[in-house]
């Protein structure tokens, strides 16, 4: 997250970290069910671990943390590497979470976002770009949903209805390492960090997010079919 600020503790209990061994964070994810996460399809790895209820980026033990294995990762069948459409994936955890103040699911919004809607994006991704500098703790940033026209103007021929753009002033954006993490609007999950320009936070080049309102049926059916 570029030019965000430290999230208040316990305010993002749905935020998950996807880790490669030993403890290398490579993507964010979101708890949407007691045993299921959503993340970006481009974050798919065969071997990874899931950390929930953790505030700092470092692997130091925190009393609220819960660690999991992913037993199934189900990318949306319409995703196409290295493209950006349908960039979402469900991950089934090896057991159900223990609900606490630090670990709790969030509902996926069935309403599509309208321009001007205020949202919050979070993650442990780099805080500088093109340089790489990772934060000590989870970062939060207020962003506004842009109109689809502004989004298409920013990225001609690259935007479809499975995506939406959001940003703030130049210099504020999600970035590498935030992928798969949550965009929360009006208390529900509206999007996932998907892609954007490089370097991040350039003027008139907003972040692009997976438009989850288009996938509520797929999410529900996939969880039901695999539970």
């Amino acid at each position: 997250i570029i030019n965000g600020s430290d999230c208040d503790m316990h305010t993002q209990p749905w935020q998950a970290a996807l880790l490669l061994r030993p403890n290398q964070l490579y993507c964010g994810a979101v708890l949407v069910h007691p045993q299921w996460l959503l993340t970006a399809a481009h974050c798919r790895k065969k071997v990874f671990r899931v950390r929930l209820g953790h505030y700092s980026l470092s692997p130091v033990y925190e009393s609220g943390q819960q660690m999991f294995q992913g037993v199934k990762s189900i990318p949306h069948p319409g995703y196409s590497h290295p493209g950006h459409s349908n960039d979402l994936m469900l991950i089934k955890l090896n057991r159900r979470i223990r609900p606490t103040k630090d670990v709790r699911p969030i509902n996926v919004s069935s309403h599509c976002p309208s321009a001007g809607t205020k949202c919050l994006v979070s993650g442990w991704g780099t805080t500088k770009s093109p340089q790489v500098h990772f934060p000590k703790v989870l970062q939060c940033l207020n962003i506004s949903v842009l109109s689809q026209k502004r989004c298409e103007d920013a990225y001609p021929r690259q935007i479809d209805d499975t995506m939406f753009c959001a940003g703030d002033k130049a210099g504020r954006d999600s970035c590498q390492g935030d992928s798969g993490g949550p965009v929360v609007c009006n208390g529900s999950l509206q999007g996932l960090v998907s892609w954007g320009d490089y370097p991040c936070a350039r003027p008139n080049r907003p972040g692009v997010y997976t438009n989850l309102c288009k996938f509520t049926k797929w999410i529900q059916e996939t969880i039901q079919a695999n539970s």
């Epitope: 061994r21 294995q69 995703y79 695999n226």
Partner: antibody, heavy 117, light 110 residues
């Protein structure tokens, strides 16, 4: 050097159990998923199953109930057991490492197992 | 059940030819497809993963494309060392799968 080496008896009697081990060197099993694949003489590749560092195991549907895949991280080895074998199980058996992006990037040289009395 | 079908099962070509092998999945596997080359008596070798990403050390004459259900492996200019059997493998799911591999395509000298 990253290497995989399968070993085990080359001959197994019908209705017996085929047991193979795959010795892993040059990388820790804790970081990778491992696969077993077989190839009957003159035929194509058949996936048998995968084992993950967390000991989660996926088996091919034909192998469920007959195949057991396990690993010993302290010895850095993966094992395959196939019970109630018939002549149709005669094949070259390979272990392979997944590159973490769903491609098998390191393979053992394979070991031929013949099922015959 | 996800099934992988390769075509053709064999083909004859000459050095310098452009060769195309196709792999079709019975359901969408998104981009989780790998291609392997196998020579007689040897273990398979990874050529391409994620449908189009070239594995380390693989010559650039090999390329992969496709997503969903239809995939292609192309050898832009066939070399003598490329005469071998080629297999595709899906990595989308392991649930209720008989085989993740396609049936293979043998590339022979014309």
């Amino acid at each position: 050097e990253v290497q995989l080496q399968e070993s085990g008896p080359g001959l197994v009697k019908p209705s017996g159990t085929l047991s193979l081990t795959c010795a892993v060197s040059g990388f820790p099993l804790s970081n990778y998923a491992m696969s077993w694949v077989r190839q009957p003489p003159g035929k194509g590749l058949e996936w048998i199953g995968d084992i993950y560092p967390s000991d989660i195991i996926d088996y091919a549907s034909w192998a469920k109930g007959r195949v057991t895949i396990s690993q010993d991280s302290s010895k850095n080895q993966v094992s395959l057991k196939l019970s109630s074998v018939t002549a149709a199980d005669t094949a070259v058996y390979y272990c392979a490492r997944d590159n973490n992006d769903y491609g098998l990037d390191i393979w053992g040289q394979g070991t031929l197992v013949t099922v015959s009395s | 059940a996800y099934q992988m079908t390769q075509s053709p099962s064999s083909l004859s070509a000459s050095v310098g030819d452009r060769v195309t092998i196709t792999c079709q999945a019975s359901q969408s596997i998104s981009s989780w497809l790998a291609w392997y080359q196998q020579k007689p008596g040897k273990a398979p070798k990874l050529l391409i993963y994620l449908a189009s990403t070239l594995a380390s050390g693989v010559p650039s004459r090999f390329s992969g494309s496709g997503s969903g259900t239809d995939f292609t492996l192309t050898i832009s200019s066939l070399q003598p060392e490329d005469f071998a059997t080629y297999y595709c493998q899906q990595g989308y799911t392991n649930s209720n799968i008989i085989n993740t591999f396609g049936g293979g395509t043998k590339v022979e000298i014309k």
